[in-house]
């Protein structure tokens, strides 16, 4: 067959699998006169064979592993054995069987983890060569675990990459494992070719022997420290370790005071820099951080609580510079005339805030010393020896000595002697009649004025009238108001009235005395009045149980999945209509009659969340009013953003040729939600090919740095292949590419010729 | 798509009853909420009744509440109004109409042609 098995000799490249034996010819080159013979040089290994008549073909199974291109020359001859045509390559690639097996590096491994540590972030790297072709299924490892001892309850503590053989915990093993219980594990881990997809794959297995450690980056106990320290400060309190040393400490102040007065050392002890007061404040929290050496948590950050403990420095203080004080002219030996109340800032029910009373001077002392006793602990005065006169002596003064168990302090009582409280206040009508009014009639309105009279001294306790609704008012709609001046009532709404629930109320007023009455005398009907208030109806707006409602659903739900319901009431009765507004995403849709509220598209956390929409509820037939809500959908975060690298990389390059092995560091992100301690990426080179050249490792959760293997390469672009991977549940992988290039440099930027001026790189390695 | 047929309109005494049938085909299956609506002469449409089509939850326009019933047979994919104690001011064309998806009332998307009811004195 011309052109397929025979023709001219020309160069050609033949592909052929590995491990066949020879089953036909390769080719027939044809001669052109003068030539008569053919003659194949170049790297046969004694397997390619040339016949005189121009027959190439192969005399046994080729093998990849030992030589993956044969590079070949055929030349054409005349009858005196001189080239006249050629030679010309002949390339024979030989194409990949799986004849290999994986085969672990180390027959067993042993590493440690320490409890707690983050989950997938890994502690060992099991590590496997397969002879076979990387960039074939034939060469593709699959990593897993094939049993862990011990399990308990089931449960894998450990995890491993199936692509890179990263052995981390799991969240379980993250949480469980404890050095206590169980202080080591064996794992058996397999390795398959084929990327572990095949029945044909093979595999080996190698044993990993792990220890767990103890995690010392533990929480300390609660610290406590007396106030006013007179010691030199700074004063270590406590401390924390990380559980290697170079961590890097630092405290957070949740709280963000004006004045934080804590610090921490590298060492991880923390200290109180200045004297605390326990009166400005009586505890602290706070978090201490231990960072790597790129500013990277380790892990998530302790909490540190330290109460401060109160020393006595603080004097009893007097409620006011003079506390006033009435009492009657007949009252009674024992009655109380009223309560001293001192303060302490000290802290209180202890012995630094715990106050005494003692009267140390009466003036004037008529008709005697002594006419008054204080109840030591209580504060209380009370009328000690005889009933007083006002027309002897009107006025008394107390000072009263208030001490805790270090301070004392005077304060000052004034007693007035007013007249003896035998006058009933008496209301000058009994009923107010009725009264009308809209249910929306407006807070703080005054609806009605009342007035009573005492014929008892002007201005003091047993003439002052206080009015109380002692009936028809339990939800305390209404209250009064009293003028000092002339004990007139002023009758307020004080809560919205509600044609609902209470369209006529029967209002009934008493009129009092703060003083009590004289022994004998009662209060009568005189004290007392009523009056109707009538509330008419106003249509009012539909009322939400809730002015927020907040759902939480996963950002994946399936479309249609119910994500939320609301529920308004018609203060009417009237049955209502529920829409949504501001839907900008078109996300949702609402069950008017219900309320219930579903989506009707993908959700994606990513684009904002909250989701904030509004909900209207609206009567139905009636005046139509409507009411506006907020519905908060909260979508929780799905693994759903592969790794991308966090900017252009465009424009990077390497003089040429290379002096010196050269490397570039690049950062990765993407869109999930990451907690506390920010993401954390793994980095391996996208394909297997690079690996000659170029070499990947990881500085921390989010950068990487790329480092040439040698210094041989050629002065054009490079385009380098980088696979991301983000270790989440599932775990997503992005391959992302850098493109470098190898220039010829002109102090230190690449030079190109006039007319080569596109596409220059602008970031020299 | 849903197509809608209505049934059962007609002539009425005042006080009188009327019940009102309406068939739902095609992707019934996608109902959010069923309702009736009524137009009388010279006036603007108007909700009656509505329903949730899987909690069967309803809804009244103030004029009929107590008076019109809506209900739906999930099996028979129809949605019915029972009419009582009718006055003249309920005559109308009354239309059935479903609704899949949206924000309100007013994105009722599939509509029947209409049943005239009448109501005399």
């Known amino acids: 067959q011309e052109g397929k098995f025979s023709g001219p000799l020309k160069p050609m490249t033949f592909s052929i699998y590995e491990g066949q034996e020879p089953s036909q010819i390769i080719f027939q080159f044809k001669a052109n006169p003068p030539a008569v013979t053919f003659e194949l040089t170049g790297e046969t290994d004694n397997i390619f064979v040339i016949e005189r008549e121009g027959l190439l073909y192969y005399n046994r199974a080729l093998d990849r592993e030992t030589r993956s291109t044969h590079n070949l020359q055929v030349a054409a001859l005349d009858a005196n054995g001189i080239i006249v045509e050629g030679p010309v390559p002949i390339t024979i690639k030989v194409k990949d069987i799986n004849d290999n097996r994986p085969t672990f590096l180390q027959s067993k491994y042993e590493g440690s983890v320490r409890q707690n540590s983050r989950p997938g972030k890994p502690f060992l790297y099991v590590n496997a060569t397969d002879l076979d072709d990387p960039a074939t299924p034939n060469g593709q490892l699959y990593y897993q675990i094939v049993i862990q001892l011990p399990m308990i309850n089931n449960v894998m503590y450990f995890q491993i990459n199936n692509k890179t053989g990263a052995i981390s915990l799991t969240r379980e093993g993250s949480q469980e494992l404890n050095p206590a219980k169980n202080p080591s594990y064996n794992l058996v881990i397999s390795v398959k070719d084929m990327g572990g997809q095949s029945e044909n794959s093979f595999s080996d297995t190698t044993s990993v022997d792990i220890i767990v450690t103890e995690n010392i980056w533990k929480a300390p106990k609660p610290v406590e420290m007396v106030e006013n320290s007179t010691d030199p400060h700074p004063i270590k309190i406590t401390q924390v370790r990380w559980n290697d040393p170079g961590a890097q400490y630092s405290l957070v102040d949740k709280e963000k005071l004006p004045r934080f007065p804590f610090s921490i050392d590298q060492e991880g002890d923390i200290y109180v820099t200045q004297p605390l007061d326990r009166e400005e404040k009586d505890a602290y929290v706070f978090y201490a951080v231990a960072k790597d050496e790129y500013g990277k948590p380790l892990s998530y950050p302790l909490e540190i609580h330290v109460k401060v403990k109160d020393i006595n420095d603080n004097p009893p203080t007097c409620p006011s510079p003079v506390t006033v004080f009435e009492v009657q002219e007949n009252e009674r030996l024992g009655n109380s005339i009223g309560t001293l109340t001192a303060h302490d800032r000290d802290e209180e029910n202890t012995a630094n805030s715990f106050l005494n009373y003692r009267i140390v001077e009466q003036t004037p002392k008529l008709p005697m010393d002594g006419l008054f006793l204080i109840q030591t602990y209580a504060g209380m005065l009370q009328l000690a020896k005889q009933s007083l006169k006002k027309q002897d002596t009107p006025q008394y003064n107390l000072t009263i000595e208030v001490s805790d168990k270090d301070f004392k302090t005077l304060c000052f009582v004034q007693i007035n002697v007013i007249d003896i409280n035998d006058q009933i206040p008496i209301f000058e009508k009994s009923d107010y009649g009725n009264l009308t009014l809209a249910e929306d009639t407006n807070i703080g309105s005054t609806i009605l004025t009342i007035q009573a009279t005492d014929a008892d001294e002007p201005f003091t306790g047993s003439s002052k009238i206080l009015y109380h609704i002692i009936k028809g008012d339990s939800e305390g709609r209404l209250g009064v108001d009293t003028d000092p001046h002339t004990n007139t009532g002023y009758v307020i709404i004080k809560k919205p009235l509600d044609f609902e629930t209470a369209a006529v109320s029967n209002i009934v007023f008493k009129a009092e005395n703060p003083e009590p009455l004289v022994f004998g005398v009662k209060y009568n009907a005189s004290s007392f009045a009523k009056f109707t208030l009538i509330v008419t109806d106003v249509n009012e707006a539909p009322q939400f149980s809730q002015h927020v409602f907040q759902a939480k659903v996963s950002e994946d739900v399936a479309i249609g999945t119910k994500v939320g319901n609301v529920t308004a009431k018609d203060p009417e009765g009237l049955d209502i209509s529920y829409s949504l507004r501001g839907d900008t995403r078109g996300w949702l849709k609402i069950d008017h009659v219900t309320g219930e509220i579903f989506s009707v598209a993908p959700l994606d956390r990513e684009a904002g969340s909250p989701y904030r929409v509004q909900v209207v509820a609206t009567e139905v037939g009636g005046s139509s009013l409507s009411s506006v809500s907020e519905f908060h959908l909260i979508l929780m975060d799905v693994n759903d953003n592969p790794p991308r690298l966090a900017k252009d990389y465009t424009g990077l390059f390497f003089c040429h040729p290379l002096s010196a092995p050269g490397s570039l560091i690049f950062e990765a992100t993407d869109d999930d939600q990451h907690l506390f301690r920010g993401p954390h990426f793994t980095f391996s080179l996208g394909s297997g090919s690079l690996q000659n050249d170029w070499e990947v490792s990881k500085i921390n959760g989010t950068h990487a740095r790329l480092s040439t293997r040698h210094t041989e390469f050629e002065e054009r672009e490079y385009v380098v292949l980088i696979r991301i991977n983000d270790g989440g549940r599932p775990p997503l992988e992005g391959i992302v590419s850098l493109p470098v290039t190898f220039c010829s440099c002109v102090e230190g930027s690449c030079f190109r010729p006039a007319g080569h001026q596109t596409g220059i790189p602008t970031v020299g390695m | 798509e849903v197509q809608l047929v209505e049934s059962g309109g007609g002539l009425v005494q005042a006080g009188g009853s009327l019940r009102l049938a309406c068939a739902a085909s095609g992707r019934t299956d996608s109902i959010l909420n069923m309702g009736w609506f009524r137009q009388a002469p010279g006036k603007e449409r108007e909700i009656v009744a509505a329903?949730?089509?899987?909690?069967?939850?309803?809804i009244y326009t103030a004029s009929v509440k107590g008076r019109f019933t809506i209900s739906r047979d999930k099996s028979k994919n129809t949605l019915y109004l029972q009419m009582s104690s009718l006055k003249p001011e309920d005559t109308a064309v009354y239309y059935c109409?479903?609704?899949?998806?949206?924000?309100?009332?007013?994105?009722?998307?599939?509509w029947g042609q209409g049943t005239q009811v009448t109501v005399s004195s």
């Open positions: 329903i949730s089509w899987f909690r069967g939850e309803t």
């Open positions: 109409a479903a609704r899949n998806g949206g924000y309100d009332l007013n994105d009722y998307a599939y």
